[in-house]
């Protein structure tokens, strides 16, 4: 039988090495066996080049490009092939739909004041261009109780978080992770960094009366 | 050392057709661009094709669109160009010159980096 | 297509001056930030052409520090401090951005 695409190939880029595209067959597919993404820079004396997809779920394709270090101007071609047959084609430009790294190694310390300090590394070079566009949000809540949950916007340059433990409960365990995202480019979210895990032990005022 | 030594240039009359070849050593050859330029006797230089690494991606001038081709054989680290239908303003030396580096998705720049002596064509009845 | 207009077409300068060539292009030359494909190149009497600059401003292996490239966009000067007497010969700008590529008509360099 025939092999069509259901969902069109959505493309999303970290703005530094890698691209990635997913799109959704009609119905279940080897991806790696039976499709081929190619890709080629709208660029004088590009080549073309070939990724090989792998399977997210049964008739779901993922493709995982390395580019070089992007810049605004970039336009790829993408063609879908199964075989010979073309089955998509469009162009993706970077820069347009950017989605960023995850932050990485969140940590919780405790902090003077009854405050907790939350600290993250920005996952971009300072050479790239996102480096000095991220901001963040922070999600806290506690293990258990999914109604005690906090929501916090970080839009300053550095990747901390201050946090009064009075405003947690105490004794209770929390979790926190962080995304980040870049506002002049008009990204989407990052996926949301590991959780890391801390106890509250802040003891309310009024237990000192 | 990097080199480039075209042949092929000859005497050839109006309609007729050529071959140029360009050998290639001193550097890797197929990660390559490659391109022509030809000067008319007394004149400037003027850009006639150019071939990515693969051979895959061609480009050509419109003066020369659909009557010159642009080739190359990795394996003999060898460039060509087939120029067909010839015409007197095609008269001119030329030459082959290495371009951009096309092995990285963006290829790398550095201009035209290294040319060839050049071979001389000249079309006349 | 891009067109390349060079100023002036010739140009004497006595030994150990400096020459200023012009090099204009119909678009922008500007793909991302530091990187315009414009390049000088050297064609000494009865040579091949010689590379000087690539992107605008980058020497070309062996090209001594006399020559330089500036500008962005749309204007780009090659200068050459303390002429020499070997530097003589015709001086071409190329883009190299887009197809077609092209050349400027020439500056001739005559020392005095």
């Known amino acids: 039988g025939s092999v069509k695409v259901l969902h069109e190939p959505s493309c999303f880029s970290d703005y530094i090495s890698t691209s990635v595209c997913q799109w959704k067959m009609d119905h279940p597919t080897n991806c790696s066996a039976e499709l081929r993404l190619s890709y080629q820079l709208d660029f004088m004396g590009s080549e073309n080049h070939t990724c090989v997809p792998e399977n997210r779920e049964d008739s779901v394709c993922v493709c995982s490009m390395p580019i070089d270090d992007a810049v605004e101007a970039d336009v790829y071609q993408l063609d879908l092939w199964a075989g010979q047959q073309l089955l998509w084609s469009g162009s993706f430009q970077p820069s347009k739909h950017v989605k960023p790294r995850t932050p990485g190694n969140l940590t919780v310390h405790p902090n003077i004041s009854h405050t907790w300090l939350l600290m993250w590394t920005n996952p971009y070079p300072t050479e790239n261009h996102l480096h000095s566009e991220l901001t963040y949000m922070v999600n806290v809540s506690n293990d258990n109780d999914p109604e005690d949950f906090k929501v916090y916007n970080v839009t300053y340059m550095g990747p901390t978080l201050r946090l009064a433990a009075s405003t947690l409960k105490s004794g209770a365990s929390y979790s926190a992770r962080v995304r980040a995202w870049a506002q002049t480019y008009n990204s989407t979210w990052s996926d949301w960094s590991p959780s890391t895990t801390w106890l509250n032990y802040y003891e309310p005022w009024e237990q000192h009366l | 050392e990097v080199q480039l030594v075209e042949s092929g240039g000859d005497l050839v009359k109006p309609g007729g057709s050529l071959r140029l070849s360009c050998v290639a050593s001193?550097?890797?050859?197929?990660?390559?661009?490659m391109t022509w330029v030809r000067q008319a006797p007394g004149k400037g230089l003027q850009w006639v094709s150019l071939?990515?690494?693969?051979?895959?991606?061609?480009y050509y001038a419109d003066a020369v669109k659909g009557r010159f081709t642009i080739s190359r054989d990795n394996a003999k680290n060898t460039l060509y160009l087939q120029m067909n239908s010839l015409r007197a303003e095609d008269t001119a030396v030329y030459y082959c010159?290495?371009?951009?580096?096309?092995?990285?998705?963006?290829?790398?720049?550095?201009?035209?980096?290294?040319w060839g002596q050049g071979t001389l064509v000249t079309v006349s009845s | 297509d891009i067109v390349m207009t060079q100023t002036p077409l010739s140009l004497s300068v006595s030994p150990g001056e400096t020459a200023s060539i012009s090099c204009r292009s119909s678009q922008s030359l500007t793909y991302s930030i530091g990187y315009n494909y414009l390049d000088w190149y050297l064609q000494k009497p009865g040579q091949s052409p010689q590379g000087l600059i690539y992107l605008g401003h980058k020497r070309a292996s062996g090209v001594p520090d006399r020559f330089s490239g500036s500008g962005s966009g749309t204007d780009f000067t090659l200068r050459i401090s303390r002429v020499e007497a070997n530097d003589t010969g015709v001086y071409y700008c190329?883009?190299?951005?887009?197809?077609?590529?092209?050349f400027g008509q020439g500056t001739k360099l005559e020392i005095k």
């Open positions: 190329m883009q190299g951005l887009q197809s077609p590529l092209s």
């Open positions: 001193g550097f890797t050859f197929r990660d390559y661009a």
């Open positions: 010159a290495v371009d951009r580096k096309t092995k990285t998705i963006r290829p790398q720049y550095y201009g035209l980096w290294v």
């Open positions: 071939i990515n690494g693969s051979g895959g991606k061609t």
